[in-house]
Amino acid sequence: GSSPRSGVLLRGCPTHCHCEPDGRMLLRVDCSDLGLSELPSNLSVFTSYLDLSMNNISQLLPNPLPSLR
């Protein structure tokens, strides 16, 4: 479902990643150096920046982030 419009709800931050707001709606997500072997599954559609460096992700499927623009 759609997230209600609110200034007090935190946008989705994947487990163990470090997140910080980017303006009114967006979210910068740092998932670097977490030993991930695949993309985080619960990325917010409001993600403006995603750092997956220093992980063990060997390949990406076509269109791996369909919810992101």
Epitope: P4, R5, S6, G7, V8, L9, L10, R11, G12, C13, T15, H18, C19, E20, P21, D22, G23, R24, M25, L26, L27, N42
Partner: antibody, heavy 117, light 107 residues
Framework: QVQLVQSGSELKKPGASVKVSCKAS????????MQWVRQAPGQGLEWIGE????????NYNQGFTGRFVLSVDTSVSTAYLQISSLKAEDTAVYYC??????????WGQGTTVTVSS | DIVMTQSPATLSLSPGERATLSCRAS??????LNWYQQKPGQAVRLLIS???RLHSGVPARFSGSGSGTDYTLTISSLEPEDFAVYFC?????????FGGGTKLEIK
């Protein structure tokens, strides 16, 4: 620097109304939501509701609909909380606080509202 | 509404000691947790957002952790100015709800 300055303490009789103001400075008022939270004597924090000053869109806690009304006057960068038909249990400290993407980063100093006959 | 439960209600420690404050949500809040500090006569202060993100100006002795329903605020070595009341708050769903608070007092 960011400042939220609230109006002074109020002593009201049951059934009366009160309007608490929160004057914002040090940032662009319409870029941040304004939250309202109350704290009854010796109690924890309770969310009343929020307003987006850019268009006055509001969300209220279900327990605060009806008697509690949030508003803003962007020309003076001020948010307001009006409570009507005051009851003794409305006695509390009322806080305004600004928020952006989910957390409240600056709070007002609080306004004590006492309801007593 | 999501119920937030903090423990202990009061924690008595000495400066230099490590403080561990707990916050439990009645359902999974997906790391959407903030911590605040309240001192008498002062404005409430944001310490940590998104479970572990330190707000600007907050000393590095404060840290946040946890997942799912269980979260922790840790103060690695208590300073005299840290004795206060601490509240957790979930930002997962409306209405946002706060824990009842933990009072950190000097032993």
């Amino acid at each position: 620097q960011v400042q939220l300055v609230q109006s002074g303490s109020e002593l009201k009789k049951p059934g009366a109304s009160v309007k608490v103001s929160c004057k914002a400075s040090g940032y662009t008022f319409t870029n941040y939501w304004m939250q309202w939270v109350r704290q009854a004597p010796g109690q924890g924090l309770e969310w009343i509701g929020e307003i987006d000053p850019s268009d006055s869109y509001t969300n209220y806690n279900q327990g605060f609909t009806g008697r509690f009304v949030l508003s803003v006057d962007t020309s003076v960068s001020t948010a307001y909380l009006q409570i009507s038909s005051l009851k003794a249990e409305d006695t509390a400290v009322y806080y305004c606080a600004r928020s952006l993407s989910g957390y409240v980063d600056y709070w007002g100093q609080g306004t004590t509202v006492t309801v007593s006959s | 509404d999501i119920v937030m439960t903090q423990s202990p209600a009061t924690l008595s420690l000495s400066p230099g000691e490590r403080a561990t404050l707990s916050c439990r949500a009645s359902q999974d809040i997906s790391n959407r947790l903030n911590w605040y500090q309240q001192k008498p006569g002062q404005a409430v202060r944001l310490l940590i957002s998104y479970r572990s993100r330190l707000h600007s100006g907050v000393p590095a002795r404060f840290s946040g952790s946890g997942s799912g329903t269980d979260y922790t605020l840790t103060i690695s070595s208590l300073e005299p100015e840290d004795f206060a009341v601490y509240f957790c708050q979930q930002g997962n769903s409306l209405p946002p709800t706060f824990g009842g608070g933990t009072k950190l007092e000097i032993k």
